[in-house]
Interface confidence: medium
């Protein structure tokens, strides 16, 4: 595939990344499936100032991001190491609460009003923010 | 500090245009999310356009095909557009700056009343 | 559109007691709700998000709760800069705000 030179219609590009932020709110399963839609991932963060973009165009809305520990440990979507990357969790998170009455803990990540993150249930319908790099390949055919 | 200072309003006539301006301070318009919100003469308030860091535009569906949300980067100003003015669009205009894509506004200006009426 | 319904129009209360504020949505906004303050001649002002966060520089007397449909702005103590109209604002899907409840002085 080629290149991605530049960010699709309505995507913000933000140091080599694209992001697009949802205005609806879906299940964990359903925004990662509806961003790989879009060869793209559920957002991956990876660094302060990635946190402090992010957090500047959600504001103070419950968001999920790509970080979930359904298998067991936490893990990043697109494989980023969680032991030794970036974290920004509340105090006293992820705690994999079950006193929800949901079933279950909370094996899925996301943004809070303050940015912080908490672990929640996946299936609450939270807003989320897709990501793809720029640098990667597409999925489309090259033009002949 | 941040300040946003309405301008633009005044009387005028049924099926008439005029363009609003929300001269910024204190922050960059072009890097937020801004809308206009608009107070009938005792009323409550009505969220009318709102304009993306990307520059995609959105509208109320009241509004929907006559007034355009814009801003002119150079000189830190957004601006509405309103044309085919009609007697309910009488109110007091506020600009208000977004807190975030989707969340509440954390800024407002102190309001330009425009009057729809012959 | 979520229509957003507030009650009472209009509360008349002494300085110093607590005034209840109510807000109702026509369906669920989650703990995406807003409240704003607008006094004579001032720009609105955010009180609250999250339902019950208070906004920068925002006194303590000023508490939000509820979360769904309910929701209830609480002002502890009255001060004379509190006799204003409030308005609560959900942010849910797109916004639209309450028709406001003037709080004045009894």
């Known amino acids: 595939g080629s290149e991605r030179t530049c960010c699709p219609v309505n995507w913000v590009e933000h140091e080599r990344s694209c992001y697009w932020f949802s205005r609806s709110g879906k299940a964990w399963a359903d925004a990662d499936n509806y961003c790989r839609l879009e060869d793209a991932h559920l957002v991956v963060v990876t660094s302060w100032e990635e946190q402090k973009f992010v957090q500047h165009h959600i504001g103070p809305v419950n968001t999920w991001m790509g970080l979930h520990d359904q298998n067991g440990p936490w893990k990043w979507v697109d494989g980023t190491d969680y032991e030794t990357g970036f974290k920004n969790w509340r105090p006293e998170q992820p705690d994999d609460w079950y006193g929800h009455g949901l079933g279950g803990g909370e094996d899925c990540a996301h943004f809070t009003d303050d940015g912080r993150w908490n672990d929640d249930v996946c299936q609450r319908p939270y807003r989320w923010v897709c990501e793809t790099e720029l640098d990667k390949a597409s999925q489309e055919p090259p033009l002949l | 500090e941040v300040q946003l200072v309405e301008s633009g309003g005044g009387l005028i006539q049924p099926g008439g245009s005029l363009r609003l301006s929300c001269a910024a301070s204190?922050?960059?318009?072009?890097?937020?999310?801004m809308s206009w919100v608009r107070q009938a003469p005792g009323k409550g308030l009505e969220w009318v356009s709102v304009i993306y860091t990307g520059g995609s535009t959105y509208n109320a569906d009241s509004v929907k095909g006559r007034f355009t949300i814009s801003r002119d980067n150079s000189k830190n100003t957004l601006y509405l557009q309103m044309n085919s003015l009609r007697a309910e669009d009488t109110a007091v205009y506020y600009c208000a700056r977004n807190w975030g894509m989707a969340g509440p506004f954390d800024y407002w200006g102190q309001g330009t009343l425009v009057t729809v009426s012959s | 559109e979520i229509v957003m319904t507030q009650s009472p129009a209009t509360l008349s209360v002494s300085p110093g007691e607590r005034a209840s504020l109510s807000c109702r949505s026509s369906?669920?906004?989650?703990?995406?709700l807003a409240w704003y303050q607008q006094r004579p001649g001032q720009a609105l002002r955010l009180l609250i998000y999250g339902a019950s966060i208070r906004a920068t520089d925002i006194p303590a007397r000023f508490n939000g709760s509820g979360s769904g449909t309910e929701f209830t702005l609480t002002i502890s103590s009255l001060q004379s800069e509190d006799f204003a109209v409030y308005f609560c604002q959900q942010y849910n899907n797109w916004w639209t705000f309450g028709q406001g409840t003037t709080v004045e002085i009894k």
């Open positions: 369906q669920s906004v989650n703990s995406n």
């Open positions: 204190g922050f960059t318009v072009s890097s937020n999310y």
